[in-house]
């Protein structure tokens, strides 16, 4: 059970950045999903390695004085989601605005019909372009 | 079947990153090979979880405009190579430079006899000491 | 056999990480333990993919001119300990300090009793927000 | 290239101390076990003390356990020996060497070694 998604650009204004089964992406079988293109949903029980990674673009004038963070969260059936995973990075001070690059990943146990998604600060400074931003995970 | 190799610094011009089996390095049978020093390739079909790191050292002022990116490419036989992940972080201002780390990691299929590599915007700006750089796969 | 362990602020004034089995934790089974509250220790012989990320807040004036390193070091029975891999990012210009994130994550083989832990070159500068600073293994 | 330069040696009488120095470059410091080694006149080789590359663990010769301790500050590349109640027998060139890494414990096998520094405990 395995997947590797791709980042989508959405005009939403939710945190939770949009994933799509496009370019070279993986989905094993499915016994994982991507539901809603926001969340992967696992059927099966089991410890799974969960990683995201996300190029954002920012301007520490243009943005506000709290840092980039990404969120890596679960949402377990019948419980309040929870942060598994968080990066932070200063915004830069290049002009217009400078690249950075964030990777999160672990071991965590899932139960079946969990759904683990990413959120980060300002969607409106991650980039898009070819393998720049992507997520998934494997079962162990 | 597994791999991580370590890099090695090169006098080649190529923007394709050099590595070696030396170090406390992986490989783990004659499944995975490192060809021509400069890629990992593969001999069977399968989910493989692959990843890169690079540090590197740059200055804004000593650099281009554009920021530093490190690409993790497959190759296919018969195929055009093809980006599969890639991370940008923008030059620091320390001087005379300032170092940055980058990690890229999925989980991507490949055909027998493909082949991955690293690919970064500037090779002379990479950091060799020990542990700095490193490249390597498993198969799930 | 896979942990996942989270980040504990240390009063103790050594380099080394301190972790506990806390929040989201994964502890599969006895054959990997946690010890001391610093190192991953295995029972078994095998090749393990292990990763930490440590997320740090520094400010380039109040800190050292060289710059944060995270090492991920192994210690074998009956031998020294070693360097696995090492991120290095330099510090930020933000004020009081600015957060940045270093992943870390390699294949390696590991003997029976082989402790995996990791250093860095200022614990007081390294975040324990929630999901902000991990460690972890699996094995293959 | 890896270059090992010891320093503060010097003459000194019995009982009394010394600190030597040795400054490390052109590898990675702190992924290194260091040892301190001397050649008394006219004599062989003789391991002295180990230190690991984090620091935290080290290793003596009976002859000088309770009186040497090494120590290493790896933000300066730079390993130390202290030598207090120095006694005639004490009298050698002490060289710094590096070791391999992950070496095995009792390993004494050294591929770079310093120029030396002397040590004199006479009265």
């Known amino acids: 059970i395995a997947a590797h998604v791709i980042s989508e650009a959405s005009s939403k204004t939710t945190s939770v950045l949009q994933w799509a089964e496009k370019g070279y992406y993986t989905m094993s079988n499915n016994l994982v999903t991507l539901e809603n293109g926001k969340q992967l949903t696992v059927k099966r029980q089991g410890l799974y390695y969960i990683y995201a990674q996300v190029t954002f673009c920012s301007n520490r004038e243009a943005s506000s004085q709290a840092p980039f963070i990404a969120s890596l969260c679960l949402k377990s059936p019948g419980r309040f989601e929870r942060i598994l995973l968080r990066a932070a990075n200063t915004h830069s001070s290049a002009k217009p605005c400078g690249q950075q690059s964030i990777h999160l990943g672990g071991v965590f146990e899932l139960q079946p019909g969990a759904s683990v998604f990413v959120n980060v600060t300002d969607p409106s400074q991650v980039s898009h372009g070819t393998g720049f931003t992507s997520f998934g995970l494997l079962k162990l | 079947i597994a791999a991580h190799v370590i890099s090695e610094a090169s006098s080649k011009t190529t923007s394709v990153l050099q590595w070696a089996e030396k170090g406390y390095y992986t490989m783990s049978n004659n499944l995975v090979t490192l060809e021509n020093g400069k890629q990992l390739t593969v001999k069977r079909q399968g989910l493989y979880y692959i990843y890169a790191q690079v540090t590197f050292c740059s200055n804004r002022e000593a650099s281009s405009q554009a920021p530093f990116i490190a690409s993790l490419c497959l190759k296919s036989p018969g195929r055009f190579e093809r980006i599969l992940l890639r991370a940008a972080n923008t030059h620091s201002s320390a001087k005379p430079c300032g170092q940055q780390s980058i990690h890229l990691g999925g989980v991507f299929e490949l055909q027998p006899g493909a082949s991955v590599f690293v690919n970064v915007t500037d090779p002379s700006q990479v950091s060799h000491g020990t542990g700095f750089t490193s490249f390597g796969l498993l198969k799930l | 056999i896979a942990a996942h362990v989270i980040s504990e602020a240390s009063s103790k004034t050594t380099s080394v990480l301190q972790w506990a089995e806390k929040g989201y934790y994964t502890m599969s089974n006895n054959l990997v333990t946690l010890e001391n509250g610093k190192q991953l220790t295995v029972k078994r012989q095998g090749l393990y993919y292990i990763y930490a990320q440590v997320t740090f807040c520094s400010n380039r004036e109040a800190s050292s001119q060289a710059p944060f390193i995270a090492s991920l070091c192994l210690k074998s029975p009956g031998r020294f300990e070693r360097i696995l891999l090492r991120a290095a990012n330099t510090h930020s210009s933000a004020k009081p300090c600015g957060q940045q994130s270093i992943h870390l994550g390699g294949v390696f083989e590991l003997q029976p009793g082989a402790s995996v832990f990791v250093n860095v070159t200022d614990p007081s500068q390294v975040s324990h927000g929630t999901g902000f600073t991990s460690f972890g293994l699996l094995k293959l | 290239e890896v270059q090992l330069l010891e320093s503060g040696g010097g003459l000194v009488q019995p009982g009394g101390s010394l600190r030597l120095s040795c400054a490390a470059s052109?590898?990675?410091?702190?992924?290194?076990?260091m040892s301190w080694v001397r050649q008394a006149p006219g004599k062989g080789l003789e391991w002295v003390s180990t230190?690991?590359?984090?620091?935290?663990?080290?290793y003596y010769a009976d002859s000088v356990k309770g009186r040497f301790t090494i120590s290493r500050d790896n933000s300066k590349n730079t390993l130390y020996l202290q030598m207090n109640s120095l006694r005639a027998e004490d009298t050698a060139v002490y060289y710094c060497a590096k070791l391999l890494m992950g070496e095995y414990l009792n390993s004494r096998t050294f591929d770079y070694w310093g120029q030396g520094t002397l040590v004199t405990v006479s009265s």
């Open positions: 052109g590898f990675t410091f702190e992924g290194y076990p």
């Open positions: 230190i690991s590359p984090l620091g935290p663990d080290t």
